[in-house]
Interface confidence: low
């Protein structure tokens, strides 16, 4: 009732409770005096369903036949209208519309733990829309009876409370849940179950591992289990890594011995567990160990490449590179890389450990065989030693790879190619393509990129290190025992027109002709590899087109002659520069008039 | 056995607005209709509104229809009561209550009731 009803009554027949589809009847009466003032004829009551007018009538009762309700709770009120006044709410009703439970199905019981209790879930089925009450029963031998109540509307779980032991494992126990509301009953198919088949054992704990001597393929792996467990089944993978390997293992009594591991690398182990071979369920996976894997000896070695830079007569600049080991090669942290120089024919040697570089440059007379073995070292050891004589990488011209070109492929990429050399090609027994960024002064610090390329492979693709808009010189060499021979190439992957021409700084005056001299443009401002430098002049104050003088790129040229200029005539000059995408904007302009008369 | 707990209750401005909630513990709170009631000083208690158990049907007094708003959270086990457009006249204790036999009839016969927090509205 809504409120107490103090002035009237609203009965529901034949019940508030109803199915989907049934008629009810609801009547709303008014209590002794309690109609409107003056004339009781003039009673208006009048029902509501929710806040919709759904009825009314005039007199002390109203009666009303109502169908189709939907699912769910729909509320009545009846109120009472007298002349000159508010509506008065007289009473209200609740009417709840469901269905009758349906037969619970997949009635399923677990106990988590030797020391757990026992619960069990079901399917419900579909929504009833009522309270509906489900009664859990379990039984077992000697007539033993265990039975729970559960009254939350989602009902599909319920603890007993109890726990079974494994002093009979073979003794069957059976569930059934039964679901009641308003409207009916219905009880689940029974469950019959043993100890073995419903306990499922809490996952391992205490994991640990032990390595003997320090040794990845002396690994154990520990942990504590469930007294009564049977099988294991242990699960690894390294940290980085999606898939896992997977063991099983039977009477482990929390201990196995893992063979497969990898050194320096950190894995992640999981165990889980079971009480009988064919009968319940594995416990869940265990909280993860985590653990690096000892260090191992490098295995693999060294790609090392070196550059000879001319000093003197006497002297030579030996620059080696080499790259890193891959993770799986190292086995561990490199703590230092050794480097022995040798003069092969008097056997003079220098050792070097090199910490934090992959790269050492050293000064050595231009005479004598050279040779240098570089290899890497870690906690455990060292890689076999990679072994170079040092000669002069493009002293045989026959060797040199022909029709060398640097195409660009895609972003960051440029495509090299070449014919093999006129020389036997089949003398070659591996091409190495280097690259580098193009300074103007011949950097020697400037990184040097390089990579092998098998015999018969007559094209590398180049990605790494390489930028867009800048201009990387390319050599291409064909080695052959102690001889090697190379050919070179500008390449770019992107580039457009320079963004500024060449600064003049100088302009000389040399037996009836002038020589011009320039600043390199920025490497930044270049935009790619430059192919051409222009010389533009035209007498000042003439409104004539410019002559001008085109002039391949050089890296190392910044000054060129011209000897077309009249004598007293004052000349305006400036430069541009060009890539394949066009030409930069004017340098300066500088004037100059011959015979002295330069400003 | 399910305990109550109203919070939000305080001094606001007339036509301003309130959010009181009321906290439940206990595993089954999604089993029961929850209803909100209020007393102002020498006055009976009120019926104020009351929401089912999903959420889906919700019931106010006249007096506060239009302007206040029942909800819940079942996962939070919190029932809330927004109150807009607050009057002078809303200014009360205000009770949450719980029934696990949401079928009987609406009405003050609640099981499970709060300590109530006290809302006063100025003008």
């Known amino acids: 009732k809504i409120d107490a009803c103090k002035r009237g009554d609203v009965t529901v027949k034949p019940s508030h409770v109803i199915l989907l589809g049934s008629t009810v009847n609801i009547t709303c009466s008014l209590k002794p005096r309690q109609g409107c003032f003056h004339y009781s004829r003039r009673n208006k009551l009048i029902l509501y369903k929710f806040d919709r007018r759904i009825n009314f009538h005039h007199g002390h009762s109203l009666n009303s036949q109502v169908t189709g309700l939907p699912l769910g709770t729909t509320l009545f009120v009846c109120k009472l209208a007298c002349i000159n006044s508010d509506e008065i709410q007289i009473c209200g009703a609740e009417i709840f519309v469901g269905v009758a439970p349906e037969q619970p199905q997949n009635l399923s019981c677990i106990q988590k733990g030797e020391q757990g209790t026992v619960a069990c879930t079901w399917e419900r089925g579909r929504d009833t829309h009522l309270y509906t009450e489900y009664t859990l029963q379990l039984s077992g031998p000697k007539n033993l009876t265990w039975q729970k109540q559960c009254k939350d509307i989602y009902c599909d779980y319920l603890d007993f409370g109890i726990n079974l032991t494994p002093e009979s494992p073979e003794s069957n126990f059976t569930a059934k849940v039964t679901a009641v509301n308003s409207l009916g009953s219905s009880s689940s198919l029974p469950s019959t179950f043993t100890f073995l088949d419903i306990v499922r054992p809490l996952p391992p704990w205490d994991i640990r591992i032990k390595f003997q001597k320090a040794s990845v393929s002396r690994c154990t792996l520990y942990w504590r289990d469930e007294g009564l467990v049977l099988l294991n089944r242990l699960r690894y993978r390294p940290s980085n890594s999606r898939l896992w390997n997977m063991v099983n293992v039977t009477k482990a009594k929390g201990r196995h011995d893992l063979l497969d591991l990898k050194p320096f690398t950190e894995y992640e182990f999981q165990i889980s567990s079971k009480l009988h071979l064919y009968k319940g369920s594995w416990s869940d996976w265990s909280e993860s160990l985590r653990a690096q894997t000892p260090e191992e000896e490098p295995t693999g070695m060294l790609d090392v490449w070196y550059m000879k830079r001319h000093i003197d007569y006497s002297r030579q600049q030996i620059s080696l590179f080499w790259k890193n080991l891959s993770v799986s090669e190292a086995r561990g942290k490199i703590l230092h890389y050794q480097v022995t120089l040798q003069e092969l024919t008097g056997g003079k040697a220098m050792t070097q450990n090199i910490t934090g570089h992959t790269s050492w440059t050293t000064v050595i007379p231009r005479t004598g065989n050279w040779a240098v073995a570089v290899s890497a070292a870690n906690s455990k050891g060292s890689s076999l030693p990679t072994r170079i004589n040092i000669m002069n990488l493009c002293e045989a011209g026959l060797l040199a790879p022909r029709q060398v070109s640097a195409n660009s492929e895609g972003m960051d990429n440029i495509l090299v190619t070449w014919q093999p050399p006129r020389k036997d090609p089949s003398a070659v027994q591996e091409y190495v393509v280097e690259w580098r960024e193009l300074h103007p002064g011949g950097d020697t610090q400037v990184p040097l990129n390089w990579l092998r390329s098998r015999p018969y492979n007559v094209s590398a693709l180049i990605s790494e290190n390489i930028k867009s808009y800048i201009c990387y010189e390319i050599r291409v060499y064909a080695l052959s025992g102690d001889q090697g021979g190379c050919s070179s190439i500008l390449g770019n992957s992107k580039h457009k027109a320079p963004l500024s021409g060449p600064h003049i700084n100088a302009i000389t005056e040399e037996k009836g002709s002038i020589l011009i001299s320039w600043n390199s443009i920025p490497v930044q401002e270049q935009m790619g590899c430059l192919l051409h430098y222009r010389i533009y002049w035209k007498e000042r104050d003439s409104n004539s087109q410019p002559q001008l003088c085109e002039i391949p790129y050089r890296v190392s040229q910044n000054s060129h002659p011209i000897n077309s200029l009249q004598p007293r005539v004052t000349y305006v000059l400036w430069m541009t520069a060009l890539t394949a995408a066009g030409e930069s904007s004017h340098g300066n302009e500088r004037e100059f008039c011959l015979q002295g008369k330069a400003n | 056995q399910v305990q109550l707990v109203e919070s939000g209750g305080g001094l606001v401005q007339a036509g301003n607005s309130l959010r009181l909630s009321c906290a439940a513990s206990?595993?089954?709170?999604?089993?029961?209709?929850v209803g909100w009631f209020r007393q102002a000083p020498g006055k009976e208690r009120e019926f104020v509104g009351r929401i089912s158990w999903s959420g889906a049907r919700t019931y106010y007094a006249d007096s506060v229809k239009g302007r206040f708003t029942i909800s819940r959270d079942n996962a939070k086990n919190t029932v809330y009561l927004q109150m807009n457009s607050l009057k002078p006249e809303d200014t009360a204790v205000y009770y949450c209550a719980a029934d696990l036999k949401w079928e009987v009839l609406l009405s003050e016969h609640f099981e499970y009731w709060g300590q109530g927090t006290q809302v006063t509205v100025s003008s």
């Open positions: 206990g595993r089954t709170f999604s089993s029961y209709v």
